[in-house]
Each structure stands twice: as C-alpha cells, then as structure tokens.
C-alpha cells in the first residue's frame, strides 16, 4: 500500500510531444509502468514507457508525430492513463482528461547567438523551437544573465512581455565573461508553465579602450 501522495503531471509542447511525470511515494522502483494516450477526435492511440528519474518518480514522452507537425488543437481532449504491471495484468493507477492547450510547456529556446557585443552592452538573439503557429505572437520570455561570482538563482529575471526573440543587455562590465539564458511561455492555458531554460550562451564584453596620455 502507498501511504504518501502520488501525482501525474503532463505537458504538451504545442506540436507533437506530451511529456509526463508520475510520482508515487513508497512505490517500488522496479515496477513497470506506462502512459497511455487516447484522444477524443483522433484515430491514433499512443503509449510510452515510464522510466525512473528519481527515487519515486518516472517520466516518459508521448511522441505523436514528426517534431514540427501539429498533432493536437485547442479543442482536443486526450484521456491519459498511468498503467502499472501487477503480475500478468496492467492496472490503472491514475487517469485524467488532458486539454493540451491548457497544459503547455514549450521546448527551450535554441540557436542563441551574440549579434553584437561592446564594452558595456551585448545584443543576443534566439529562436523558439517546435512552437505552434496557433500562438501567433502570444508568447512571453524571461531571460537571465550570469555575472562572475554569482549563481543563476541570484540572477535577476528580465521579462519580455511580447514575442521578441532578441535582447540588448546593458550596463555590463568591460572585458568580463558572462553567460545568458532565456525561456519561453505561451500566454494561453490555465496550467501552462515556463519552458526549461535554454542552454547557456557564454560571451565576453570588449575591453575598455586604453586612456591616452596627455
């Protein structure tokens, strides 16, 4: 018997992937479990095997098609089940009707690059990956810059309240190594959350010009 809590959480990346995590306090690590997806208006069913990610949680990705294909819409409902093997049969452990566009988590932004760097400022651009065309411009971003001697957690968050895939970082210190990350979130969806942070982009500001003797 499981004495603690259990939780089944899934997110749709807006294109062709539903990522799920099943956690259960006190469950056996070697239990074989899977997630089954049954859409209300599609011909396909999909299953993925839950694999351990920590002592009491398992994760898997339901791959619905090619990465950039639009497999679900705002009107779709997908019934998701967690099934675990008990002896010779599969037992339902959790169930929910999943509204994909109410539970969004996009892929991390990609292709970060320094467009222009000076002594005190740096212009950086990026791209969003596998994001639905349904969003049009209804996205927001958060960015953070890692300064020497600090941690990512200490870095102040810069918020871009529109679909702006670039930023100009100001008031930087000359000849200094920095790292930069960005994440994205659609405005749509009651349970929508931020994407993972992008891979960090390392850059260095230019040294200050040497003063001339007078």
């Amino acid at each position: 018997a499981v004495n603690g809590t259990s939780q089944f959480t899934c997110f749709y990346n807006s294109r062709a992937n539903i990522s799920c995590v099943w956690s259960q306090d006190g469950a056996l690590q070697d239990t074989s479990c899977q997630v089954h997806a049954w859409p209300d208006r599609r011909r396909w069913n999909q299953t993925c095997e839950l694999l351990p990610v920590s002592q009491a949680s398992w994760a898997c990705n339901l791959i619905l098609g090619a990465p950039d294909s639009q497999k679900l819409t705002t009107v779709d409902i997908v019934t998701l089940r967690v099934l675990c093997r008990e002896g010779v049969r599969w037992r339902v452990m959790a169930i929910q009707d999943f509204k994909p566009f109410e539970n969004l988590r996009l892929m991390a932004p990609i292709s970060l690059q320094v467009v222009h760097v000076e002594t005190h400022r740096c212009n950086i651009s990026w791209e969003i990956s596998q994001a639905s065309h349904y969003f049009e411009r209804h996205l927001e971003f958060e960015a953070r810059t890692l300064s020497p001697g600090h941690t990512w957690e200490e870095a102040p968050l810069l918020t871009l309240k529109q679909k702006q895939e670039w930023i100009c970082l100001e008031t930087l210190t000359p000849d200094t190594q920095y790292e930069f990350q960005v994440r994205v979130k659609p405005l749509q969806g009651e349970f929508t959350t931020w994407s993972p942070w992008s891979q960090p982009l390392a850059f260095r500001t230019k040294p200050a010009a040497l003063g001339k003797d007078t």
């Epitope: 004495n3 809590t5 259990s6 089944f8 409902i77 019934t79 967690v82 169930i95 009707d97 109410e102």
Partner: nanobody, 125 residues
Framework: QVQLQESGGGLVQAGGSLRLSCAAS????????MAWFRQAPGKEREFVGA????????FYADSVEGRFTISRINDKNTVYLQMNSLKPEDTAVYYC??????????????????WGQGTQVTVSS
C-alpha cells in the same frame, strides 16, 4: 473551493441495487476528476472508482469491477455510483471526492482535496 454532497444511501438486500448521487457546487465541475471512496466500520477508507472530467475514462477497485459503474452529468454538476449485485461486504459509508482542479484521479485518498460528508449503505444478507 468545491462542496460535495452525497445522497441515495440506504438499506438494501444482498443482490439488490442502489444508485448514489453526489451534487457539486462551487467551482467549474467539469474541471474535476471525481471519485468514490468507502469506509466500512473499523476499516480504512478505500478507493471504489474514479471518472475523468468528461466521463470518457473510468477505473475501479478490483472488489467492485463489473458490479459498480460511475457516471457523471456535467450540466447537472452531479456524479453517480450505480451499485449492482450488492454484497454484505459492500456495507460502508460512501464518500464522493475530487482532487485539485486539473489533477489526475488516483487510487490514493491522500491525493484528494475535496470530500463530501458521506452516505451510509447497508447491505443485509
């Protein structure tokens, strides 16, 4: 906040049927998985079955599978438990419950946030 109120319990003979109702008020009913649990005298509360937000999906405890059926009518903010082929061991207080909005239904009572007061079902032999 969701308020739940069960009704329909009573005394029935073994082999008989009974239909319990659970009326919900408060938040949007159709956002919630709904479940039934029961507690017999001197025993722990046990999972009976659950139904998804639209009613597309259900699952049941082994002890009631094939005899009990959960259904819901979202327009009426009501979930039902149809109990057939009742046995004396089905005697218990039956509770309607729901997890937080958007959460999945599980077999674990710890995962449920909202509970009704319960309705007594007694099956005589």
């Amino acid at each position: 906040q969701v308020q739940l109120q069960e009704s329909g319990g009573g005394l029935v003979q073994a082999g008989g049927s009974l239909r319990l109702s659970c009326a919900a008020s408060g938040r949007t009913f159709s956002n919630y998985v709904m479940a039934w649990f029961r507690q017999a005298p001197g025993k722990e509360r046990e999972f009976v079955g659950a139904i998804t937000q639209t009613g597309r999906g259900t699952f049941y405890a082994d002890s009631v599978e094939g005899r009990f059926t959960i259904s819901r009518i979202n327009d009426k903010n009501t979930v039902y438990l149809q109990m057939n082929s009742l046995k004396p061991e089905d005697t218990a207080v039956y509770y309607c419950s729901a997890p937080r909005s958007g959460r999945a239904g599980t077999r674990n009572q710890m995962d449920y946030e909202y509970w009704g007061q319960g309705t007594q079902v007694t099956v005589s032999s």
